[in-house]
């Protein structure tokens, strides 16, 4: 007895595909060993056709796949475009040779069944419309026309020219003639359902002189497309239901026993289990749409169906498309925090993983919005201007080669709570969802900047200090100048670092930054933060206003620059010249519902001056104290 199990007999018809699941005992060795599918020859030799080692025979090229699901202790062999030559005896098995553990599978591929010469075969999908053509001779031009459905020996009338319609075809069947045609009539049956399948006879006239035509109607259930995705990756269901339902509400549902539970529809319904990780995007005016789900979980595996109906709910006799989603737990996408917590006034540093092979890809961070079908407008990107309302408090730090980038958001408010997505313009599977939860602060922030009303005077020296608690003693402290393309580290001086690490005086832990001499372009947002290597921690932000000291006039304390700047720090166009090579972020229009152009203003010279290159001769104005 073989411990491998599978279907002993598989039968299909030419042109179709099969998906054969083989089950193996759940052991570590079995999970990782070679899986194979071979064809049994008359000589007893079993010739490998496909294996999990990557081997694919010539006769299976472009039409077969073998996928291992170690978490289920199964592997699946998919074979498409079957021909009668595929009929034969096969083995699915495990091991380095084809003589190890295996299971015998018999595959039989038949010809598409043929009908008598006078039978016209109509093949339609569920929910579609069929037009049955009925020819007759001139002698029956004025006779009664009808279409009936064979049930055993009887033929039950579906519709006739006296305006009779069988109740089960009410509002679905019409009998008509086109133009001036005198030898043909048509019957349309719409919203096809599986029970409509069968043999129909159309007739013109009565008795022996009647003209009859046979029609075989085949109503096809949607063949589910198989989708194999990794845990924590994303999946896109591309749904094309045809122009006839272009104006009807669209939905995606998940099959559950005999119902199909709606996950999302265009009428605003959304399953709470998919909150923050789903987008429905209309593609065009012909009814095409797509549904993207990120952060795939094990429980997302199953049968999905998209459809259209005015109610936004599944309805029998309306077109559908089907998928079976498999979620592989052996994922290349690392496990990252799905919930990040912050407090008002504080900050969060969110680590976004991306495919390490695509370190040069553009990185983005967007805010998932629940309205309508869900959308995710970009807030920041490697070549995207920071969205209005986030100036001075949002930055993206790329760490090339590390397989991750960090997004920092500070000056948090409870309105920042919600779902955010990390994504790149590269591998679309690497889209991660983070839920940010912002609670009201109950204590003072860890980092505090003095002076809080920061106004520097051109030509003078200006120092700003950041106080940090002893718990950050061993971490690297930094100041950076925020601009639309990031926060560029400045040289700074750590007062606390001179002390013995044994005694830490809470009051004297300070990192300060000096601008000497102050220039007009020094105006803007500055961040004080802590980090350990590439791991960013807490940050706080301050807006430094710059003014000219007019001779003899007293120093006027302006309104709180930080309160003002949060509303509109735009009056000084600090980085105004546009770098042509970075002018536009080429975002995948399929992802973003609002396909706005995101432009990036960045002055290269300014960037050099404000970078952390203390030793360069680039007119560095931020210097050590």
């Amino acid at each position: 007895q073989s411990p491998i199990f599978g279907p002993q007999d598989v039968s299909s018809i030419e042109g179709n595909s099969v998906s054969i699941t083989c089950y193996y005992p759940d052991t570590s060795v079995n999970r990782h060993t070679r899986k194979y599918w071979c064809r049994q020859g008359a000589n007893g030799y079993c010739a490998t056709l496909i294996s999990s080692n990557g081997y694919l025979s010539k006769e299976y090229s472009g039409r077969a796949s073998l996928i291992n699901f170690p978490e289920n202790s199964t592997f699946v062999i998919n074979i498409a475009h079957l021909t009668q030559e595929d009929t034969g005896s096969y083995k699915c098995g495990l091991g380095t040779t084809n003589r190890g553990l295996f299971f015998d599978v018999s595959l039989e591929v038949s010809q598409v069944p043929e009908f008598p010469n006078d039978t016209h075969v109509y093949t339609k999908d569920i929910g579609r419309t069929v037009t049955i053509e009925c020819r007759f001779k001139e002698g029956n031009a004025h006779s009664k026309k009808s279409l009936c459905k064979k049930r055993g020996e009887a033929c039950e009338v579906v519709i006739d020219s006296t305006e009779y319609v069988d109740p089960s075809y009410k509002d679905r069947a019409i009998l008509f003639m086109k133009g001036t045609s005198r030898d043909i009539f048509y019957v349309n049956i719409s919203h096809l359902i599986p029970s409509d399948a069968g043999l129909y006879v159309c007739q013109a006239g009565e008795g022996p002189s009647a003209d009859k035509n046979n029609a075989d109607l085949q109503v096809l259930e949607p063949e589910p497309e198989l989708l194999y995705k990794d845990l924590r990756s994303s999946v896109t269901f591309e749904c094309d239901l045809g122009r006839e339902v272009a104006n009807d509400a669209k939905y995606l549902c998940r099959k559950n026993k005999e119902t199909c539970d709606v996950i999302i529809n265009t009428l605003g319904k959304r399953d709470p289990a998919f909150e923050g990780r789903i987008l429905l995007t209309p593609r065009d005016d012909n009814g095409r749409f797509s549904v993207l789900i990120t952060g795939l979980r094990k429980e997302d595996a199953g049968h999905y169906q998209c459809g259209a109906h005015s109610s936004g709910l599944p309805q029998e006799g309306w077109p559908v498309q089907a998928w079976q989603l498999f979620v592989n737990e052996e994922s290349t996408i690392p496990n990252s925090r799905s919930v990040v917590k912050g407090v008002t006034g504080g900050s969060v540093a969110i680590v976004c993983p991306y495919n390490p092979k695509e370190s040069s890809s553009l990185k983005y961070w967007c805010h998932w919005e629940a309205d309508e079908n869900g959308r995710c407008p970009v807030l920041v990107g490697t070549q995207a201007l920071v969205q209005e309302g986030y100036e001075g408090r949002l930055a993206l730090f790329d760490q090339p080669g590390s397989g991750a980038y960090t997004v920092i958001l500070n000056q948090l408010t409870t309105q920042d709570s919600g779902f955010y997505w990390c994504l790149t313009d590269g591998d679309s599977r690497w889209r991660t969802t983070i839920e940010l939860q912002v609670a009201e602060a109950t204590k003072k922030p860890d980092l505090e900047v003095t002076p809080q009303n920061a106004t520097a005077v051109i030509g003078e020296t200006f120092t700003i200090s950041c106080h940090y608690p002893c718990k950050f003693y061993s971490q690297e402290k930094y100041w950076c100048k925020w601009s639309n393309d990031g926060c560029h580290i400045l040289p700074s001086h750590d007062e606390g670092a001179r002390q013995s690490s044994v005694s830490c005086d809470q009051s004297s832990q300070i990192v300060s930054m000096t601008l000497n001499p102050v220039k007009k372009e020094d105006e803007g947002w500055y961040w004080c933060g802590v980090k350990e290597g590439q791991v960013y921690g807490e940050t706080t932000a301050i807006y430094v206003a710059v003014e000219e000291r007019t001779r003899g006039s007293p120093h006027i304390n302006p309104t709180d620059a930080n309160a003002r700047a949060k509303d509109a720090p735009e009056e000084e166009a600090m980085e105004s010249s546009v770098r042509e090579d970075e002018n536009k972020a080429n975002l995948d229009p399929r992802l973003f519902a609002d396909e706005r152009e995101i432009q990036n203003a960045g002055d290269q010279a300014q960037e050099n001056r404000a970078s952390g290159n203390a030793g360069s001769a680039g007119g560095q104005s931020g210097s050590s104290k």
């Epitope: 039968s11 018809i13 998906s19 054969i20 259930e221």
Partner: nanobody
Framework: EVQLVESGGGLVQAGDSLRLSCAAS????????MGWFRQAPGKEREFVTT??????????YYADSVKGRFTISRDNAKNTAYLQMNSLKPDDTAVYYC?????????????????WGQGTQVTVSS
């Protein structure tokens, strides 16, 4: 809901044949697989055979103990599954249950099936 009604059980001699039928009614369009399990007195319910389908493709699964003797088939138009049992043995004596599933991960596992019939007794005497 899907209702399943088994028929065809009875008392036969060892070596004889028997054909069981399972008629499905209700929302049968949602079913994806139909199978047979059996339960002998004092024993657990065990997998016998299952047929699953996707469009014109059929997959037939059998327990090792019945391979080569039992054959499962279905009539789509009649929403009926059949179990042809040949070369019956006294060990085959049990109540045979028909089961239907809407989604099937492992056909051998009873809990994967959503609907069950009342069962039909098969007794094989030696």
């Amino acid at each position: 809901e899907v209702q399943l009604v088994e028929s065809g059980g009875g008392l036969v001699q060892a070596g004889d044949s028997l054909r069981l039928s399972c008629a499905a009614s209700g929302r049968t369009r949602t079913t994806y697989g139909m199978g047979w399990f059996r339960q002998a007195p004092g024993k657990e319910r065990e997998f016998v055979t299952t047929i699953t389908w996707s469009g014109p493709t059929n997959y037939k699964y059998y327990a090792d103990s019945v391979k080569g003797r039992f054959t499962i088939s279905r009539d789509n138009a009649k929403n009926t599954a059949y179990l042809q049992m040949n070369s019956l043995k006294p060990d085959d004596t049990a109540v045979y249950y028909c089961a239907a599933s809407t989604v099937l991960t492992d056909p051998r596992v009873p809990t994967e099936y959503d609907y069950w019939g009342q069962g039909t007794q098969v007794t094989v005497s030696s």
